[in-house]
Amino acid sequence: ESGYAQNGDLEDAELDDYSFSCYSQLEVNGSQHSLTCAFEDPDVNITNLEFEICGALVEVKCLNFRKLQEIYFIETKKFLLIGKSNICVKVGEKSLTCKKIDLTTIVKPEAPFDLSVVYREGANDFVVTFNTSHLQKKYVKVLMHDVAYRQEKDENKWTHVNLSSTKLTLLQRKLQPAAMYEIKVRSIPDHYFKGFWSEWSPSYYFRTPEINNSSGEMDPI
């Protein structure tokens, strides 16, 4: 009976949509790389489903993912980073769907951090600085950053600035006086590697001075 049940499960499984997406993070933990995959349909029953990557690996032909709630995850040094790997969704030994992917084309950088804003009274501007772990990496060193800021009362009116450095100057006259602003930053690979935007950094909140205010450095909130 269990044999019939398993066959039935498999037949049902073949009717489902097992579309999935993945992103890689290179040198995310020392020299270790990671690969994260998830189903695009959140309602997929993942009980018996596994992910496997084969090809373009060092010292092994295939690796199995670990399941962490709704996501599937590998952390390893064994990505060759040359050529395409075959990533498959499997039930037992049967592959339900596969994708051939070059892991260097699905890179998601780590989120920037240490975002801060300093007001320069003499220059009448704001210096935005942040940090990224990618400055120390061997592979994904060159990033494009997207700094987004908005007046706190304007729910969806974000202003975006793209830059390749980790420092940005905002002119005081471009901002509203005596207003509270929220600012955040994210990154995407910009040289050789391809992929996706990182998560946003934690937001930083700052208040612009009154028009004739001479307070010097602004206070973060």
Epitope: V60, K61, L80, G83, T104, Y139, Y192
Partner: antibody, heavy 117, light 110 residues
Framework: EVQLVESGGGLVKPGGSLRLSCAAS????????MHWVRQAPGKGLEWVSL????????YYADSVKGRFTISRDNAKNSLYLQMNSLRAEDTAVYYC??????????WGQGTLVTVSS | NFMLTQPHSVSESPGKTVTISCTRS????????VQWYQQRPGSSPTTVIY?????PSGVPDRFSGSIDSSSNSASLTISGLKTEDEADYYC?????????FGGGTKLTVL
């Protein structure tokens, strides 16, 4: 139809230089890892070098490291091998090969490099 | 670095079956996929087996590949030999970012 056409081979004196080219067509070149493999007269295949789809990753056999440079121009669908400080033992037919989903499913016809005084 | 060792030559009659071995000197044969190439005289190499036992389209099913962990070797088997199979055959494996070729085996169809 996939085509790889090597050129640039010829006779060169020891210590001299040559630049080999490989013109690719019939596939998505900028999605493919590319290799150079050589074969000395009457001998077996010897891997020389590879370059990733983007040009970032380049690797070389110990026998050519520091003398040969692999590069690519994705806009021109072309692969190159700059060979400096050539030696007699570099005499061989040089093939470019497309890795695709598995190494060597497509090879060029080869270009002969002869190093002799 | 490891080496891949093949017999220098093998010969067999048309219609028969021949097996060419490829033995890895150190490290496991299972650690990366094996490919096999056929090179006819005066021609470029072509892939006959990839990923240990997979045949590219257009390669007849007379060609098969296998791995034997106990002998740390790979094998290419050609059944129903034809005169057109006369060629040099090379095995290949990745070694990190390098490719390692076997020395080649000359197959003569008598």
């Amino acid at each position: 139809e996939v085509q790889l056409v090597e050129s640039g081979g010829g006779l060169v004196k020891p210590g001299g230089s040559l630049r080999l080219s490989c013109a690719a067509s019939g596939f998505t070149f900028d999605d493919s890892v590319m290799h150079w493999v050589r074969q000395a007269p009457g001998k077996g295949l010897e891997w020389v070098s590879l370059v990733g789809w983007d040009g970032f990753f380049t690797y070389y056999a110990d026998s050519v490291k520091g003398r040969f440079t692999i590069s690519r121009d994705n806009a021109k669908n072309s692969l190159y091998l700059q060979m400096n400080s050539l030696r007699a033992e570099d005499t061989a037919v040089y093939y470019c090969a497309r890795q695709g989903d598995y190494m060597g499913n497509n090879w060029g016809q080869g270009t002969l490099v002869t190093v002799s005084s | 670095n490891f080496m891949l060792t093949q017999p220098h030559s093998v010969s067999e009659s048309p219609g028969k079956t021949v097996t060419i071995s490829c033995t890895r000197s150190s490290g496991s044969i299972d650690s990366s996929y094996v490919q096999w190439y056929q090179q006819r005289p005066g021609s470029s190499p072509t892939t006959v087996i990839y990923e240990d036992d997979q045949r590219p389209s257009g390669v007849p099913d007379r060609f098969s590949g296998s791995i034997d962990s106990s002998s740390n070797s790979a094998s290419l088997t050609i059944s129903g030999l034809k005169t057109e199979d006369e060629a040099d055959y090379y095995c290949m494996q990745y070694d990190f970012h390098h490719l390692v070729f076997g020395g080649g085996t000359k197959l003569t169809v008598l």
